[in-house]
């Protein structure tokens, strides 16, 4: 009679974490008499996974009735697979004796475990940045296996190319993590923009995971200022407006200065929103011209989102007919008030 062979038909088996793994093993003969044992690994450090004869193996069940006399199928099912179960499993036939002796081994089945990556988490810079600046976004996902994974970056649906990705650890592990850093150049139109990190893995069946970051949390669009003198509303009164345009975020404080002295400070409240997500705001001053002998320099000074103040000035001619004139100046703040100036915003 032909000598018994131990057949493990599957060279490799891949199972998703949490599922059961079936490891197939058949023998070609009932002789010699003796039990089957399953091991993970080989050599002196191999681990016993199942012993047909004795022992308690709560995660292992036999696929067929291995206790039947004529049974030659010693396939097993291992439940609730985790990445730590990966390895090569050997079905080994023993010859009955005192003690039982190893008779023949199967060629082994390599079990690999597929584990899904966690939802990608995208984080941006700690501080806001202005248009034309390059900012870095990071994307992290953990717990996946096998190691092969694809990560892509998008900004508003357009794929980005300036990024660096690392999969850790470099060596072998039961599961892996991915970390990627992308560089994004901000534009003034980015308030409504999104940065997306997309992770594709064999466990996701072609349906990648995405993590997003809104550039509204990253960008700061500084305002443009325009100071204009409106037609005289009443004799001796001039209306001067400061148009604060295209700023983001909304946090903004405006100070009017008359000849360098603070006349009024207000905080942007009733702003209007532009299509691109930036804001506009207007503040006005009613100046009593008759109260002034000399020309008046009116300055609109704006502090946006905690940044250094920017300002725009307007020279109000008292002696002659008022004419519009604007220039950027360094901001003064003497803190004095002027009763002859009235203001408002809208």
């Amino acid at each position: 009679e032909e000598e018994l062979q131990v057949i493990q038909p599957d060279k490799s088996v891949s199972v998703a974490a949490g599922e059961s793994a079936i490891l197939h093993c058949t023998v070609t003969s009932l002789i010699p008499v003796g039990p089957i044992q399953w091991f993970r690994g080989a050599g002196p450090a191999r681990e016993l996974i199942y012993n047909q004869k004795e022992g308690h193996f709560p995660r292992v069940t036999t696929v067929s009735e291995s206790t039947k006399r004529e049974n030659m199928d010693f396939s097993i099912s291992i439940s609730n697979i985790t990445p730590a179960d990966a390895g090569t499993y050997y079905c080994v036939k023993f010859r009955k004796g005192s003690p039982d002796t190893e008779f023949k081994s199967g060629a082994g089945t390599e079990l690999s475990v597929r584990a899904k990556p966690s939802a990608p988490v995208v984080s941006g810079p700690a501080a806001r940045a202005t248009p034309q600046h390059t900012v870095s976004f990071t994307c992290e996902s953990h717990g996946f296996s096998p190691r092969d994974i694809t990560l892509k970056w998008f900004k508003n649906g357009n794929e980005l190319s300036d990024f660096q990705t690392n999969v850790d650890p470099v060596g072998e592990s039961v599961s892996y993590s991915i970390h990627s850093t992308a560089k994004v150049v901000l534009t003034r139109e980015d308030v409504h923009s999104q940065v997306i990190c997309e992770v594709a893995h064999v466990t996701l069946q072609g349906d990648p995971l995405r993590g997003t970051a809104n550039l509204s949390e990253t960008i700061r669009v500084p305002p443009t200022l325009e100071v204009t003198q409106q037609p005289v509303r009443a004799e001796n009164q001039v209306n001067v407006t400061c148009q604060v345009r295209k700023f983001y975020p909304q946090r903004l404080q405006l100070t009017w200065l008359e000849n360098g002295n603070v006349s009024r400070t207000e905080t942007a409240s009733t702003v209007t929103e532009n299509k691109d997500g930036t804001y506009n705001w207007m503040s006005w001053l009613l100046v009593n011209v008759s109260a002034h002998r000399d020309d008046v320099k009116l300055t609109c000074q704006v502090e946006h989102d905690g940044q250094p103040a920017v300002s725009k000035s307007h020279d109000l001619k008292v002696s002659a007919h008022p004419k519009e004139q604007g220039s950027n100046t360094a901001a003064e703040n003497t803190g004095s008030n002027e009763r002859n100036i009235y203001g408002g915003s809208g």
């Epitope: 690994g41 080989a42 050599g43 190893e102 008779f103």
Partner: antibody, heavy 122, light 112 residues
Framework: QVQLQESGPGLVKPSETLSLTCTVS????????WSWIRQPPGKGLEWIGF???????FYQSSLKSRVTISLDTSKNQFSLKMTSVTAADTAVYYC????????????????WGQGTTVTVSS | DIVMTQSPLSLPVTPGEPASISCRSS???????????LDWYLQRPGQSPQLLIY???SRASGVPDRFSGSGSGTDFTLKISRVEAEDVGVFYC?????????FGQGTKVEIK
């Protein structure tokens, strides 16, 4: 092609600890035993011990009290620490890969590092 | 521990001629599966050892077929059918049945 590279100090003072690291490149840690073997000047090969990918270790009984082998699969490295060294520990130290296909024994030490000379001297 | 004993310890050879090295183990290296846990290694001058034969008779990858291993139980032989100049060095037998792994003292092969 799997390659092994030993690294560590070439000179160790008596009574101090010898520390060597072996970096595995171009292959898998899994399903192999990772061994340290030494060769004193002009003498034969002496097995120090090995570690399996599952973390189990085996040591030469005469060295067991002084030797620790550890494995860092995340870096594809394994290490040897030998405490209380004496001049008798002067040798070329090899790291090596031992195959295990099935059964209780092993199937040959098939990949060797180039060896690193360690001298124990004050 | 299993003790491995080689003979001869020195072997002068002539290129083109055959050569033979013996190795004896203090206990059988034949496992119950029928597998023999005996390996042969060659250490060329100034180099690391390299595996020639494993399992008593299986040639390792890239090893020329002029090398062959035989024997079972406790007595083993490494044969070189035609010695070449590059075969000079020290040949070791080693057992891999149980820990500690042990090696023979080595046989130094040199050209006559």
């Amino acid at each position: 092609q799997v390659q092994l590279q030993e690294s560590g100090p070439g000179l160790v003072k008596p009574s101090e600890t010898l520390s060597l690291t072996c970096t595995v490149s171009g292959g898998s840690i899994r399903d192999y035993y990772w061994s340290w073997i030494r060769q004193p000047p002009g003498k034969g090969l002496e097995w120090i011990g090995f570690i399996y990918y599952n973390g189990r270790t085996f040591y030469q009984s005469s060295l067991k009290s002084r030797v620790t082998i550890s494995l860092d699969t995340s870096k594809n490295q394994f290490s040897l620490k030998m405490t209380s060294v004496t001049a008798a520990d002067t040798a070329v130290y090899y790291c090596a890969r031992v195959r295990a296909y099935s059964g209780i024994g092993l199937d040959g030490t098939d990949v060797w590092g180039q060896g690193t000379t360690v001298t124990v001297s004050s | 521990d299993i003790v491995m004993t080689q003979s001869p310890l020195s072997l002068p050879v002539t290129p083109g001629e055959p050569a033979s090295i013996s190795c004896r183990s203090s206990q059988s290296l034949l496992y119950s599966t029928g597998y023999t846990y005996l390996d042969w290694y060659l250490q060329r001058p100034g180099q690391s050892p390299q595996l020639l034969i494993y399992g008593g008779s299986s040639r390792a990858s890239g090893v020329p077929d002029r090398f062959s291993g035989s024997g079972s139980g406790t007595d083993f032989t490494l044969k070189i059918s035609r010695v070449e100049a590059e075969d000079v060095g020290v040949f070791y037998c080693g057992q891999a049945l149980q820990t500690p792994l042990t090696f023979g003292q080595g046989t130094k092969v040199e050209i006559k």
